[in-house]
C-alpha cells in the first residue's frame, strides 16, 4: 500500500516533473529518499530560464556570497 508516483507539472512555459508522495510513505523517510532517486530520470528541462523552471537549483546568493 506504500506507493509513489510522479506527475508533470506545468510551470510557466516549462514542464518539470514533481513528485507526489503517499502520506504513509512520509513515515519512512529513507525509503522515500531512495524512491525519489529512482524518479529523478523523469525530470524535464524545457525552459532555459532559471526563473521559469523548478528543474533548476535556483541560485540567489547576494553580494557575491556562495
Amino acid at each position: 500500500f506504500l506507493f509513489h508516483y510522479s506527475k508533470t507539472q506545468k510551470l510557466g512555459k516549462s514542464n518539470v516533473v514533481s513528485s507526489v508522495v503517499h502520506p504513509l510513505l512520509q513515515l519512512v523517510p529513507h525509503l522515500h529518499e531512495r524512491r525519489m532517486k529512482r524518479f529523478r530520470v523523469d525530470e524535464e528541462f524545457q525552459s532555459p530560464f532559471a526563473s521559469q523552471s523548478r528543474g533548476y537549483f535556483l541560485f540567489r546568493p547576494r553580494n557575491g556570497r556562495r
Epitope: 525552459s47 532555459p48 537549483f57 540567489r60 546568493p61
Partner: antibody
Framework: QIQLVQSGPELKKPGETVKISCKAS????????MNWMKQAPGKGLKWMGW????????TYSEEFKGRFAFSLETSASTAYLQINNLKNEDTATYFC??????????WGKGTSVTVSS | DIQMTQSPSSLSASLGERVSLTCRAS??????LNWIQQEPDGTIKRLIY???TLDSGVPKRFSGSRSGSDYFLTISSLESEDFVDYYC?????????FGAGTKLELK
Amino acid sequence: QIQLVQSGPELKKPGETVKISCKASGYTFTKHGMNWMKQAPGKGLKWMGWINTNTGEPTYSEEFKGRFAFSLETSASTAYLQINNLKNEDTATYFCARTGRYGVDYWGKGTSVTVSS
Amino acid sequence: DIQMTQSPSSLSASLGERVSLTCRASQDIGSNLNWIQQEPDGTIKRLIYATSTLDSGVPKRFSGSRSGSDYFLTISSLESEDFVDYYCLQFDSSPLTFGAGTKLELK
C-alpha cells in the same frame, strides 16, 4: 554521448525560404527544450528562442517574431528552424542548443546560411 | 532585457600566463551564468555553469567566480588551444543574453 547534428550550409536568394535541421541523439529528445541562436559573420551570439520538445510550443525572442518558425519531428528526434522571406541580414550561422539543468548545455556545430542575389 | 557587458573584447597573452575575463550583469542574475568557448571552426562548448562549476572534461586551469554583479572566467596557465573566443551567457530570465565575446590571442 549527446550529439546535436545540424544540416549542411545553405545558399539562398532574398525572398526564398530555408529550413535547417538539428538531429539529437544520446538522450531522451522530449525531456530537454531546444534553443536556437544566430551568429552573424564576425559578430556575437543572439538567442532566437526555444521550443518545448514535449508540447511543441515555440517561444520567440522579440527580434525573431514573424518570419521565423521552430518545429519538431519528435519521432526522428529532430528540431527545425525555418526562415521565410529571407533577407540579406539573415546571412549568419544558426546553432541549435539543448536546455539542461543550468541553461543550455550542448550545442550543435552550426549551419551557415548565406542570402545573396 | 538583461545586458551582459563583457571585457576585454580582445586580449593578447602569452603561453603559461594567467588571464581573467569579466562579465557584468545589468541586473541581478544570482549565479545563473555560464561561460562558453567557441573555436575557429564554430564549435561551441560550455566550460562553466552556474558561475563556478566546471563541466566534465574541462581542464582544471579554467575557473569561474563572482563578486557582486561581476562574473569572472580565469585561466590559470594558458595553453595553445585556449586562444579562441569566449562568451558569457545569463540564463536567469528571458531573453537569454550573451556578452559580446572576448577574443584571446597569442602574443
